[in-house]
Amino acid sequence: CKAMHVAQPAVVLASSRGIASFVCEYASPGKATEVRVTVLRQADSQVTEVCAATYMMGNELTFLDDSICTGTSSGNQVNLTIQGLRAMDTGLYICKVELMYPPPYYLGIGNGTQIYVIDPEPCPDSDF
């Protein structure tokens, strides 16, 4: 089978600070040296890119400075963290993995992680 399988958790609950973390694991059919990981958000039938990073195997993955994502990699596993989430960001977050080099190219699409975000209650005014 030439398809690349990507696994990610079905559900994750963001912290009260709007941070959600999940693992994206892929079964590489070949020995890739350069991998691109993209987080996509699917709302209704619309798909948008949340963040993307390319990394060389054995090195850390680096997102752009203004990205809301951070992550670390270990072998065929990527630990992704998305920050600054609010209740309106609740949705399905899909992990996309592309083995860019060496040939052949492979694409892997996860089933998505449903991230639930609950905005914290505002602190009541104190009488002090």
């Epitope: 398809a3 690349m4 399988h5 948008t48 899909i94 860019m100 052949p104 492979y106 694409l107 699409i109």
Partner: antibody, heavy 118, light 108 residues
Framework: EVQLVESGGGLVKPGGSLRLSCAAS????????MHWVRQAPGKGLEWVSF????????YYADSVKGRFTISRDNAKNSLYLQMNSLRAEDTAVYYC???????????WGQGTMVTVSS | EIVLTQSPGTLSVSPGERATLSCRAS???????LAWYQQKPGQAPRLLIY???SRATGIPDRFSGSGSGTDFTLTISRLEPEDFAVYYC?????????FGQGTKVEIK
């Protein structure tokens, strides 16, 4: 408007060269992989070439390897296909296509005709 | 290279009837990586179905996709006049990207 517009096709003699261009608009060009696909008269679709987001990685069909070169200029939102040592069997409509976020070719240009004949 | 074989080559159907198109892969294709396109004469292909069964934006629900592994199907439940065209399947999970040879759906 989200669109792709090809140009540069025409009539060329066997052994000649041609450079095709594809102008993208209405979307963040650098966030997508791009492809060239061709269709010979009365025939089916044949994938020709792929280029990665930053242009660092390129793949080619065996039928064009060593003769065609794909490139992109993200600053100009443009995709190119340099075709050298053209043969009669390269005669086709050439389409540029966007590799969608989930993989399929979700946006196509109108195509540009390349005819290789003496 | 994954070879995709479509059948039949030509399908003659009356408007309002159901059309079933087949696409068989030479080796297993993950269902996330199989697409169907429609092409009318003189026009560029248009994405209909991706991920084997998800309809692309703006595609009417009379088009549906199914299948997994090596066998995939595109079904048009009730053919409208504008549906008479050539249909291609494609795998996009690995290079080289490959298309089937196409099925022409013509008016009976």
């Amino acid at each position: 408007e989200v669109q792709l517009v090809e140009s540069g096709g025409g009539l060329v003699k066997p052994g000649g060269s041609l450079r095709l261009s594809c102008a993208a608009s209405g979307f963040t060009f650098s966030s997508y992989t791009m492809h060239w696909v061709r269709q010979a008269p009365g025939k089916g679709l044949e994938w020709v070439s792929f280029i990665s987001y930053d242009g660092n990685h390129k793949y080619y069909a065996d039928s064009v390897k060593g003769r065609f070169t794909i490139s992109r200029d993200n600053a100009k939102n443009s995709l190119y296909l340099q075709m050298n040592s053209l043969r009669a069997e390269d005669t086709a409509v050439y389409y540029c296509a966007r590799g969608g976020l989930l993989g399929p070719f979700d946006l196509w240009g109108q195509g540009t005709m390349v005819t290789v004949s003496s | 290279e994954i070879v995709l074989t479509q059948s039949p080559g030509t399908l003659s159907v009356s408007p309002g009837e159901r059309a079933t198109l087949s696409c068989r892969a030479s080796q297993s294709v993950g269902s996330s990586y199989l697409a169907w396109y429609q092409q009318k004469p003189g026009q560029a292909p248009r994405l209909l179905i991706y991920g084997a069964f998800s309809r692309a934006t703006g595609i009417p629900d009379r088009f549906s996709g199914s299948g997994s592994g090596t066998d995939f199907t595109l079904t048009i439940s009730r053919l409208e006049p504008e549906d008479f065209a050539v249909y291609y399947c494609q795998q996009y999970g690995s290079s080289p990207w490959t298309f089937g040879q196409g099925t022409k759906v013509e008016i009976k």
